[in-house]
Structures are given as C-alpha cells and as structure tokens.
C-alpha cells in the first residue's frame, strides 16, 4: 500500500464536523460493463405480469435531477389471456436511494444527504384471503 | 468516438406518419437518454420528447403528447421517433441528441433529418 | 413552460470583436442553461454548460456567466469560424427550451 501524505488542504479526519461536510466529485464513472449493460432489460415493463410505467421525476435541486420512477399499471396482475386476475395482486418494489439535495438558503453548490424511496418495477403477489371464522 | 446518425430526408403528404432513426455508436446505449428536438426552417427549437434506452421509460412535451411516440432497440442501438397526423407546421428538421442524465446536459446530437410534408 | 429571451436576434461584428448576447428565464433556473452554436446545414454545438463551463475541446475565447434569471455568452475575440448562429437552452425542467438564436454575421 502506498502512503499519501495528507495534504494540508486536506480535511482532518478527526475534525468534530468532517462527516458533515465532505467534499464530493459528483463525476460519475460508468462501472457496468457493455455487456451487463446490454443485459438490463428495458421491456419487463410490458412483459411483466404486474406491467408498469415509468415516469421521469424531475428535481432541479436535487443529484441526480432527473431518476425514472416505476408505477404500477394495474391494481391486479394480468393472466395468460391479457385478462386481470382478481386473486393477484400488482406491487410496486420500492428501493431506498441516496440523493443529494441542494440548500436552497445556502450557495448553490451545497448540499445535503437524503433518503429516498424509488419504485423500481412491479411484481405480482397472491391476494391475501381473509376467511371467515 | 461518439456518433449519431439519422436515417435520410423524407417526404409525407398531410395526415401521413414519418418514423425517423437514430443509430449510436461508440458508448454504452443504454446508458443515457435519448431527447428528440426538432427546428423549422428559419425558427428555434423545440423540445420533443425523452426516451432512457435503458428502462423503456419515455416523457413528452404536451404539445407532441397525441401524435409522437419514441422508442428503442437496443439490439440495434437505435432510436426511433415517429410523428402521427402529419400537417405543413411538422415541415422541420428533426434531431436526436444525448443527454447525460447525471450531468445535466446535451452533448452529441445527430445531423439532423429534414421531414417535409406537402399534398 | 419556461420562456428563454435571448436578444440580440441578430448581430453585425468583425474579426477581433468582443461579443456578448443575453438569455433571460421567464423564471429561475439556477444555473442549468447551456449555450450552443450552429453553422448552416448543421446541428447544434455544446459550448457552454451549467452557465459557465466550457464543454470539451472548446477554445477559451467562448465564456458564459449567470444564475437565476439572466444569462450572458461571450466570445472575447471574435474568429473567422464564429459566424454562426447561437442558441441558449434550459434544461431545468421539461419541456427543455432554447432561445430564438442570435445570428453573428460579419460586418
């Protein structure tokens, strides 16, 4: 391992406020390989048995600006004859993202951490059965 | 090298559809959105509409809402863009252009398809 | 949508020239305006992006300032190859939209 020396424009690590305020190259490097890339399917969305839509949720004072939302189409599940199945059930599958949101009374350049809950696509579940008793 | 190229020039008659392509090359297709902007002649532009290759998901400036419909094929790389309902105002020059979603800008853009459309 | 008023519409200038053409935002738009060029016959150009940074490859006599409502874009010697056209774009939010344009012609 190599030793950099820490530079004196540097942070101190141990400074009581360095978590809350790091300095973040926003530059995105694209990690996924072409061929991992050409593998995310694009068309579950219509395949799917719970199909959804995706719309595009823009945020000027948010990074990213702009993250594509999943919406489920249908309350119930579709069947084999494109018909809707009334004891399936369409669900959106939710992920909790990090995103970076600006301070509007602060400069421009400054932001927080938030947490935020995307649909990423639907998946069809049995309907719950309440039986009488 | 990043490259967009459009299919050719085309002539519709009014109430006709056109469908113009956009092939990219040299990055990962999936990887960012594809915008549609179009320019009449001697005027500005005009925002179309969005597609993300990579998701399927499409957004549409409400004045295209009725009569545009973009799509991708990603085993192709390409893009598509068809106008439904053809009238002499969509006489334009139609482009495509990428844009990176994280950046927050539009940087390659194709060289543009002339669409006229005459009785 | 947000309206982008970019004036002048037209502009006489010689080689050498300091230029300067405005953009101005129905509404704010942080720093999310871009600045393009485009010659006859062909696309559209980056120069400009997020107001002030200069795309890849573009000569430093390109500059843009602003934020908020109000925007400029400078070419502090004016080249052979400038004269062309140029558009101000809002990416803010959708529906994205440009400027008239502004078309450098030589005096």
């Known amino acids: 391992a190599v030793l950099i020396p820490q530079s004196s424009v540097c942070p101190n690590a141990e400074a009581n406020n360095f978590l809350q305020n790091v300095k973040v190259n926003l530059k995105v490097i694209n990690s996924l390989s072409s061929k991992a890339s050409s593998r995310r399917p694009s068309d579950y969305l219509n395949r799917s048995t719970s199909p959804w839509t995706l719309s595009r949720n823009e945020d000027p004072d948010r990074y990213p600006s702009v993250i594509w939302e999943a919406q489920c189409r249908h309350q119930r599940c579709v069947n084999a004859e494109g018909k809707l199945d009334h004891h399936m059930n369409s669900v959106l599958i939710q992920q909790e993202i990090l995103v970076l949101k600006r301070e509007p009374e602060k400069c421009p350049f400054t932001f927080r951490v938030e947490k935020m809950l995307v649909g990423v696509g639907c998946t069809c579940v049995s309907s719950i059965v309440r039986h009488a008793s | 090298e990043v490259q967009l190229v459009q299919s050719g020039a085309e002539v519709k008659k009014p109430g006709a559809s056109v469908k113009v392509s956009c092939k990219a090359s040299?990055?990962?297709?999936?990887?960012?959105?594809f915008h549609w902007v179009r320019q009449a002649p001697g005027q500005g532009l005009e925002w179309i509409g969005v597609?993300?290759?990579?998701?399927?998901?499409?957004a549409y400036n409400q004045n295209f809402r009725d009569r545009a419909t973009l799509t991708a094929d990603k085993s192709t790389s390409t893009a598509y863009m068809e106008l439904s309902s053809l009238r002499s105002e969509d006489t334009a020059v139609y482009y495509c252009?990428?844009?990176?979603?994280?950046?927050?800008?539009?940087?390659?853009w194709g060289q543009g398809t002339l669409v006229t459309v005459s009785s | 949508n947000i309206v982008m008023t970019q004036s002048p519409s037209s502009l006489s200038a010689s080689v050498g020239d300091r230029v300067t053409i405005t953009c101005k935002a129905s509404?704010?738009?942080?720093?999310?305006v871009g600045w393009f060029q485009q010659k006859p016959g062909k696309s559209p150009k980056l120069l400009i992006y997020?107001?002030?940074n200069r795309y890849t490859g573009v000569p430093s006599r390109f500059s843009g300032s602003g934020s908020g409502t109000d925007f400029t874009f400078t070419i502090s010697s004016l080249q052979p190859e400038d004269f062309a056209t140029y558009f101000c774009?809002?990416?803010?939010?959708?529906?994205?939209?440009f400027g008239q344009g502004t078309k450098l012609e030589i005096k």
């Open positions: 252009t990428r844009f990176l979603t994280y950046e927050g800008y539009f940087d390659y």
């Open positions: 040299g990055y990962t297709f999936t990887d960012y959105e």
């Open positions: 597609i993300h290759p990579g998701n399927g998901g499409t």
């Open positions: 509404q704010s738009v942080s720093i999310d």
């Open positions: 997020h107001a002030s």
């Open positions: 774009q809002q990416d803010y939010s959708s529906p994205y939209t």
